[in-house]
């Protein structure tokens, strides 16, 4: 009995034409939504003039359907038992699951103005840029629609820059009609304990973003894990959104539509400072903003974003140090709402439900040559938005799963 089930599982989780895993892997049967909450700044003038605390009010959710496109350029390599692919990106707005429309306006940090002095630290260049910022009537904050903020808008200041640069700015620009990858993952044919584990990303085994072992691409893409998952196992996965590999640990057992699953959660330890978790030392790549690597809960991913001052955190700075959230008013971190979890069916290793939560922040610093920023007396890591990407196995799929997998085991 058990041996037969094990044999069947091992056969069916291999990523090759004809298996259950492969069919679901090519195009997920789960409907995946990405909800956005935008941090609307309530006191923009006060901040720019007096370097006050930034008062924010979250507005959302604004919901998009994502990950509905099938993987493309799927190529099996029988030599090294891998399969390579790209994951196309697409987002469709879901008005019925949103509090407003894509045309809703928000007051947010001016991304181009904040990034310019960070990218160009040279005084001469900053003086030139300052004249263009003034000419374009840009300031520290701007009003943008949801659509512009997420997917891109032509920036008036950047449009005046007299040398070739991208003049379109957006938190996720470019997104639609782009792909993530190339991913090359083990198909599990020769060794089932390696199935779905990433062998390389964009042709490389390392990211080139971090020093030492922090740069490694570990584990899977979190959609599935090698089968026969034990509670003691640490699930490692790579997330291109946060430009790093991370891990989840067992939290609890849950019943998901009659299927017993293990809920794995991202521990606070994963976001700790090197002081609290020495393993994180190589994720601290700059000393000033991080207060000599004592701050925690924010990750500087600038190296992965062409030098732009982008910081990733958990929503509302959950698990972040007080110095990070102190200059921001209106944040209410909450473990249940703001943590990330994966509900993994332990026999197959399939993730049947998940909630990926993260927050996108931009660092803005005082810049004596940029009039819009010269009254600032301290740096701010400014929350722009947070997102909740969720997926749950459908009722039909769950029934099928119970019949074919868990039912047989019982």
């Amino acid at each position: 009995g058990d041996m037969l089930i094990e044999k069947t599982i091992k056969r069916e989780v291999v990523l090759e034409e004809g298996t259950t895993a492969f069919k679901n892997w090519v195009k997920t049967g789960t409907t995946v939504y990405r909800q956005f909450w935008i941090f609307d700044v309530q006191n923009p003038d006060d901040v720019a003039k007096n370097s006050s605390k930034i008062k924010v009010k979250q507005r959302g959710p604004y919901t998009y359907r994502v990950r509905y496109l099938a993987k493309e350029n799927i190529t099996q390599d029988p030599e090294d038992h891998t399969v390579s692919f790209v994951q196309p990106n697409g987002a469709i707005f879901e008005p019925s699951l949103s509090v407003g429309t894509e045309d809703d306006n928000f007051t947010v940090l001016n991304l181009a103005v904040a990034a310019a002095p960070h990218i160009y630290q040279n005084s001469f260049v900053q003086v030139v840029l300052n004249s263009l910022i003034k000419k374009s009537k840009s300031s520290m904050f701007q009003t943008r629609s949801l659509k512009e903020l997420l997917w891109g808008y032509k920036d008036p200041f950047l449009s005046l820059v007299p040398y070739p640069i991208s003049t379109t700015v957006g938190v996720f620009y470019p997104y639609n009609d782009t792909v993530d990858g190339v991913y090359k993952v083990f198909n599990g044919k020769d060794n089932i304990s390696k199935v779905a584990i990433i062998e390389s990303y964009k042709g490389k085994r390392n990211l080139s973003y971090w020093p030492s072992y922090c740069d490694m691409i570990n584990g899977t893409d979190a959609a599935s894990f090698p089968p026969f998952v034990e509670k003691s196992r640490t699930l490692r996965f790579f997330s291109s959104d946060i430009c790093r590999s991370i891990y989840a640990v067992f939290g609890s057992e849950i019943d998901l539509k009659g299927i017993p699953v293990y809920r794995f959660v991202l521990p606070a330890n994963a976001f700790a400072s090197p002081l609290q978790n020495p393993d994180n030392h190589c994720f601290c790549t700059e000393k000033v903003i991080s207060n000599n690597c004592t701050s925690y809960g924010v990750l500087d991913i600038g190296k992965c974003k062409e030098g732009k001052p982008v910081y990733i955190s958990l929503p509302h700075f959950l698990h972040a140090s007080p110095d990070v959230s102190e200059p921001i008013e209106g944040l209410h971190p909450n473990e249940d709402e703001h943590r990330t979890y994966l509900d993994v069916e332990p026999i197959t290793g399939f993730t049947l439900q998940f909630a990926k939560r993260l927050q996108v922040n931009i660092l803005v610093k005082p810049a004596r040559k940029i009039e819009a920023l010269k009254n600032l007396k301290r740096p701010y890591i400014v929350p722009i938005l947070w997102l909740n990407e969720t997926g749950t196995i459908g009722d039909e799929k769950a029934e099928m799963f119970k019949t074919q997998v868990t039912g047989k085991i019982k």
């Epitope: 040279n122 005084s123 001469f124 260049v125 003086v127 300052n130 004249s131 007299p162 640069i165 004596r368």
Partner: antibody
């Protein structure tokens, strides 16, 4: 040690052009702005313009637009200034000077004397 | 364009005396003023950069103050080696503009 080595003195005829060079060493050439400054005999200093080698961005003092052209050769870490349609008014010592991020004209070349004479 | 008016054009002081040079700008430049020393036959040398910051290796007898439009450069306890031309430079906006210079001589 940062060094800026300028080309030698030039004696040129009115109406002609001249191109002076400033070879740099001891630093990452592309990361710092190179400026050019004019000093007429016994007079003060005048900023001609600056070039940021990283992306070739240039900015000129309006007074020298059409007179001076700033370029760089990243492969040899050399900055150039061409002066055209020369008149006796252009006779001066020309300096290249380099920034240090937020410090203006932190390092200077030794100067190039340009004499315009028939 | 910000014009910079430097005074005096020349001055003659005795060794050990205190020297004061002034620059006034036509626009508010915060504290974006720099001071340079130029000895005969040499390029200028930066002494003090924006924010009244004394450059490393520059003797502490040199100092500056000022904000907005009025700036003062001071040499306490003048030495013979301080004989030179002194220039101020505003770096708040382009074009960068220098003062007319001050020729400092020893009495």
């Amino acid at each position: 040690e940062v060094q800026l080595q300028q080309s030698g003195p030039e004696l040129v005829k009115p109406g002609a052009s001249v191109k002076i060079s400033c070879e740099t060493s001891g630093h990452t050439f592309t990361e710092y702005t190179m400026h050019w400054v004019k000093q007429s005999h016994g007079k003060s200093l005048e900023w001609i313009g600056g070039i940021y080698p990283n992306n070739g961005a240039t900015k000129y003092n309006q007074k020298f637009k059409g007179k001076a052209t700033l370029t760089v050769d990243k492969s040899s870490s050399t900055a150039y200034m061409e002066l055209r349609s020369l008149t006796s008014e252009d006779s001066a010592v020309y300096y290249c000077a380099r920034d240090r991020y937020d410090v203006w004209f932190a390092y200077w070349g030794q100067g190039t004397l340009v004499t315009v004479s028939a | 364009e910000t014009t910079v008016t430097q005074s005096p054009a020349s001055l003659s002081m005795a060794i050990g005396e205190k020297v004061t040079i002034r620059c006034i700008t036509s626009t508010d430049i915060d504290d974006d003023m720099n001071w340079y020393q130029q000895k005969p036959g040499e390029p200028p040398k930066l002494l003090i950069s924006e924010g009244n910051t004394l450059r490393p290796g520059v003797p502490s007898r040199f100092s500056s103050s000022g904000y907005g439009t009025d700036f003062v450069f001071t040499i306490e306890n003048l030495l013979s080696e301080d004989v030179a031309d002194y220039y101020c430079l505003q770096s708040d906006n382009l074009p960068l503009t220098f003062g007319g210079g001050t020729k400092l001589e020893i009495k």
